[in-house]
């Protein structure tokens, strides 16, 4: 039986959720008037880049859209982007699609996502509402890199 991705709403400790704005992901306050994205998460079958200390390797997509999270270097800086891609197309590939891969690690009840292509760079939200979801190598006060994966199904 073919695996199916798991579905989650994603929220940070300031009760910000991920929202699709055009073809970008932004963080916005949890609110009835805002429709948070449902994140699709599925494990990568290829073990080429695996590192158990960093977590499980996963692909991340947006449910209901052929969009997946993707890391690329822009002007020398690792950047988080959305790329038109069906998450199951990534999953069925025999070879790991490195730019789309993230190490998913649990820290207490929270989840942390680290880029496989750019070790030490983590998915983050700013403390300011309406800002894009981005990659950072500075974990701490100004950036939030710990997320709650809320079951929505």
């Amino acid at each position: 039986r073919e695996a199916a991705p798991k579905s989650y709403a994603i929220r940070d400790s300031r009760q910000m959720v991920w929202v699709l704005s055009g073809n970008s992901l932004i963080a916005a306050p949890l609110s009835r008037s805002i429709k948070p994205v449902t994140l699709h998460l599925i494990a990568c079958r290829d073990t080429e880049f695996s590192d158990k200390e960093k977590g499980n390797m996963v692909y991340l997509g947006i449910k209901g859209k052929d969009l997946c999270l993707f890391c690329a270097e822009i002007q020398g800086k690792p950047t988080l982007q959305l790329k038109e891609k069906n998450i199951m197309d990534l999953y069925v590939e025999k070879k790991a699609q490195k730019p789309f891969l993230f190490f998913h690690n649990k820290e207490g009840s929270t989840s942390v996502f680290q880029s496989v292509s750019y070790p030490g760079w983590f998915i983050a939200t700013s403390t300011t509402s309406g800002q894009p979801i981005f990659l950072t190598k500075e974990r701490g006060i100004t950036n939030n890199t710990n997320f709650y994966l809320d079951s929505v199904e």
């Epitope: 300031r14 949890l30 509402s129």
Partner: antibody
């Protein structure tokens, strides 16, 4: 239908620890996306949020009370509890437990217990 | 002092319309967190009256309505009735405090 019921001593001595329990019926305290809070109301005054715990076990406390407050969950009894240490007369209040769901009530509280009066006095 | 500011009291005659304001800041209402309203009848626990700025839970009469703009919100009650005499509280979330915040409450007197 979800229901909440507070219980605990009505009288606590100054400098001691106030301990209250909220029993949840009609639903599970581990249900996804729910948060459970404690709110108090001093006599003749307004509502004051004390702190919350959610289904992940994450706790959030009112900054001015943080050093004195502990909120925890007992899943086996379907209860959550409040401990407030080093109490003074200023902690005399009706204490309410309340709940909501992140994706249904959006950080509001839609179910409340009936409240229990705690008096701090020697 | 409460993080959200409400008038201490408002009053109106039966059948009239009254509004109760709730003023916050850029870290709560102004940051687009929802505002919720509670009614507390004398000697009873608060009851959710409006959630998500302008939504009524089932069983709440449509005489009650909520709205939000900028850093403020308001609760309107039309066709005022004697049984509406109660304390009303607004509530939101404040990201700078990482917590829930209440207004100081407004006592509604039906004349």
């Amino acid at each position: 239908e979800l229901q909440l019921q507070e219980s605990g001593p009505g009288l606590v001595k100054p400098s001691e620890t106030l301990s209250l329990t909220c029993t949840v019926s009609g639903g599970s305290i581990t249900a996804s996306n729910y948060y459970w809070g404690w709110i108090r109301q001093p006599p003749g005054k307004g509502l004051e949020w004390i702190g919350s715990i959610d289904y992940t076990g994450s706790t959030y406390y009112e900054p001015s009370l943080k050093s004195r407050v502990t909120i925890s969950v007992d899943t086996s009894k379907n209860q959550f509890s409040l401990k407030l240490s080093s109490v003074t007369a200023a902690d005399t209040a009706v204490y309410y437990c309340a709940t909501g769901s992140y994706y249904e009530t959006y950080l509001g509280f839609d179910v409340w217990g009936q409240g229990t009066l705690v008096t701090v006095s020697s | 002092e409460s993080v959200l500011t409400q008038p201490p009291s408002v009053s109106g005659a039966p059948g009239q319309r009254v509004t109760i304001s709730c003023t916050g800041s850029s870290s709560n209402i102004g940051a687009h967190y929802d505002v919720h309203w509670y009614q507390q009848l004398p000697g009873t626990a608060p009851k959710l009256l409006i959630y998500g700025n302008d939504n009524r839970p089932s069983g709440v009469p449509d005489r009650f309505s909520g709205s939000k703009s900028g850093t403020s919100a308001s609760l309107a009650i039309t066709g005022l009735q004697a049984e509406d005499e109660a304390d009303y509280y607004c509530q939101s979330y404040d990201y700078s405090l990482s917590g829930y915040v209440f207004g100081g409450g407004t006592k509604l007197t039906v004349l």
